[in-house]
């Protein structure tokens, strides 16, 4: 891998509706399941076609789900928070943490900020050197004058 | 992503026994939640087994209870189905299949709409 791989990390509340299959999606993690190394959080791993979370648009794969209707799911096993979403009602608040891959490396999923998948360098860099020639232009016809 | 391969299986006589595996290769297995399914010429692929994560749940259709065992070994990224017993009717291609984590939703193991990934299968014939 070339580089260094950073994240911008971005926290949503995101408010989903129970649907007749479920809120639509899969979970991993906890303290008996690290998927993450040294981080026992809880993941989503999988989003179904044409469920809650599907239809919302929101929730996306990688994103780590923080607390499921205010309830903290720090420290769970994972059955404990698969049973926590199952048990949390017809309306369900999800506190969730996207992240946003912003250097070179594997892609990362695409947040709402990134629909390109550009990492932001590349912008940066050619909007510097515009600016730059643009002030250099300025300079040598304010001399002229 | 996840390659799945089956092997073991073959030509044998009723009331004899085989035994199949299922190697992961791309990702380590031990998110994932894994099946086995069959599909008899003319018919539907139709749900054999499942084992949860951790190994310490199984499920399994009526047809195999008592004659087939699901079970897995996460260090060998690798998922067993031991068949007893065989049939005639246990005649098939069986495929092994995956999902990653586990579903916040009613747990529907023998739902092949579940899974993500499929092997590519391994005959089966009881004569």
């Known amino acids: 891998m070339n580089g260094r791989v950073d994240y911008l990390v971005t926290e949503e509340e995101i408010n989903l509706t129970r649907g007749p299959s479920g809120l639509g999606f899969n979970i991993v993690g906890g303290t008996d399941q690290q998927y993450v190394s040294n981080d026992s959080g809880i993941y989503v791993s999988r989003i179904k076609e044409n469920g809650a979370a599907a239809l919302d648009g929101r929730l996306q794969e990688g994103d780590k789900i923080l607390s499921v209707n205010g309830q903290d799911l720090k420290n769970l096993l994972h059955q404990d928070a698969v049973d926590l979403f199952r048990n949390a009602g017809y309306a369900v608040s999800l506190r969730v943490q996207h992240r946003l891959q912003v250097q070179n490396g594997p892609i990362g999923h695409r947040g709402e900020g990134d629909p390109s998948g550009i990492p932001i360098f590349m912008v940066l860099v050619p909007v510097f050197a515009l600016t730059m020639v643009a002030a250099w232009a300025f300079m040598r016809y304010r001399q002229q004058l | 992503h996840v390659q799945l391969v089956e092997s073991g299986g073959g030509l044998v006589k009723p009331g004899e026994s085989l035994k199949l595996s299922c190697v992961a290769s791309?990702?380590?297995?031990?998110?994932?939640?894994m099946g086995w399914f069959r599909q008899a010429p003319g018919k539907e692929r139709e749900f054999v087994a499942a084992?949860?994560?951790?190994?310490?749940?199984?499920d399994y259709a009526d047809s195999v209870k008592g004659r087939f065992t699901i079970s897995r070994d996460n260090a060998k990224n690798t998922v067993y189905l031991q068949m007893n017993s065989l049939k005639p009717e246990d005649t098939a291609v069986y495929y092994c299949?995956?999902?990653?984590?586990?579903?916040?939703?009613?747990?529907?193991?023998?739902?092949?709409?579940?899974?993500?990934?499929w092997g590519q299968g391994t005959q089966v014939t009881v004569s």
């Open positions: 299949a995956a999902v990653i984590g586990s579903t916040v939703d009613s747990y529907s193991p023998s739902d092949p709409l579940e899974y993500d990934y």
């Open positions: 084992v949860s994560w951790s190994g310490n749940q199984q």
């Open positions: 791309g990702e380590t297995l031990s998110s994932y939640i």
